[in-house]
């Protein structure tokens, strides 16, 4: 297991919510991504492929999420001070082998200006 701080902007604030960006290498074909708050699993997304190369995407702990070819974004809404915590992206790589787990994270600071929905011009 590889642990570390995210070397990219992990938190993107908008309209009283936050997009938490969990990146993975482009070469990764099949994986599970979990979003942890402290040690608790908040959200997860699993991408696998069958023998006909058909993609299956599953969530056991569902959050609004968005998948791209090198990241999973999890969205948290209605931010309040209780959201301030360490968040971790727990990536389990199934394919290509070997199986590997990486953990990257950062601290989500909540400021007053991020709590209310702001108009964007």
């Amino acid at each position: 297991e590889i642990n570390g701080s995210a070397n990219y902007e992990m938190f993107i604030f908008h309209n009283g919510g936050v997009q938490i960006l969990c990146k993975y290498p482009d070469i990764v074909q099949q994986f599970k991504m979990q979003l942890l708050k402290g040690g608790q699993i908040l959200c997860d997304l699993t991408k696998t492929k069958g023998s006909g190369n058909t993609v299956s995407i599953k969530s056991l702990k569902f959050c609004h999420s968005q998948l791209s070819n090198n990241s999973v974004s999890f969205f948290l809404y209605n931010l309040d001070h209780s959201h301030a915590n360490y968040y971790f992206c727990n990536l389990s790589i199934f394919d290509p082998p070997p199986f590997k787990v990486t953990l990257t994270g950062g601290y989500l600071h909540i400021y007053e200006s991020q709590l209310c929905c702001q108009l964007k011009f």
Epitope: I27, Q29, Q30, T48, K49, G50, S51, G52, N53, T54, S56, K58, F94, D95, P96, P97
Partner: antibody
Framework: EVQLVESGGGLVKPGGSLKLSCAAS????????MDWVRQAPGKGLEWVGN????????EYSPFVKGRFTISRDNVKNTLYLQMNSVKSEDTATYYC??????????WGQGTLVTVSS | DIVMTQSPSSLAVSAGDRVTINCKSS??????????LTWYQQKTGQAPKLLIF???TRHTGVPDRFMGSGSGTDFTLTINSFQTEDLGDYYC?????????FGPGTKLELR
């Protein structure tokens, strides 16, 4: 240790039905796509179809589509193949296989289905 | 559907031989940096076993005398220093798209 054990094979008349089962153990069944592959006596391997982890996606060979149905029970750790309107060309050993992300990495011992009047 | 062909269909071999089995697909199996091609071994009366995936990666526990190579549409399985326990049928298989298909097989027999 991964184990797949097929059952339910036997003699069936053309146009008849048969249901095969595959009991899985030694791994988290609900984490894997599963497939059926068949082999006619003295012939090569032929893919029958597959099912994703929770049963929401199924795919079939054009040779069996509309006649065969694959399902699974993740509580019982069992894979099924419902064979309807069988033909003589369906005579084969049917293997239950685990799709291990990039290949069929575990196979059952197979169960023989004979279609004959 | 992608058609897989294999040559030769059968081959007589002796212990210590270097054995080469060829597999050709009707369209490229390369996607990104991966060739979606696997090789299986089937001994008489047994279920098949996975040998090679992604054209060249040996599956866990497979002896290093088995080597896969090739890219695109042309692939090769090589057995360096054939052993008698390697007797059986060998199948290539693609999982580039649905339906995945197998080659017709190559039978290795003792000379």
């Amino acid at each position: 240790e991964v184990q797949l054990v097929e059952s339910g094979g036997g003699l069936v008349k053309p146009g008849g039905s048969l249901k095969l089962s595959c009991a899985a153990s030694g791994f988290t069944f609900s984490d894997y796509w599963m497939d059926w592959v068949r082999q006619a006596p003295g012939k090569g391997l032929e893919w029958v179809g597959n099912i994703d982890e929770d049963g929401s996606i199924t795919e079939y060979s054009p040779f069996v589509k509309g006649r065969f149905t694959i399902s699974r029970d993740n509580v019982k750790n069992t894979l099924y193949l419902q064979m309807n309107s069988v033909k003589s060309e369906d005579t084969a050993t049917y293997y239950c296989t685990r799709w291990g992300r990039f290949g069929f990495d575990s196979w059952g011992q197979g169960t023989l289905v004979t279609v004959s009047s | 559907d992608i058609v897989m062909t294999q040559s030769p269909s059968s081959l007589a071999v002796s212990a210590g031989d270097r054995v080469t089995i060829n597999c050709k697909s009707s369209q490229s199996l390369l996607s990104g940096s991966f060739n979606y091609l696997t090789w299986y071994q089937q001994k008489t009366g047994q279920a098949p076993k996975l040998l090679i995936f992604y054209a060249s990666t040996r599956h866990t526990g497979v002896p290093d005398r088995f080597m896969g190579s090739g890219s695109g549409t042309d692939f090769t399985l090589t057995i360096n220093s054939f052993q008698t326990e390697d007797l059986g049928d060998y199948y290539c298989h693609h999982h580039y798209n649905a339906p995945p298909t197998f080659g017709p097989g190559t039978k290795l027999e003792l000379r």
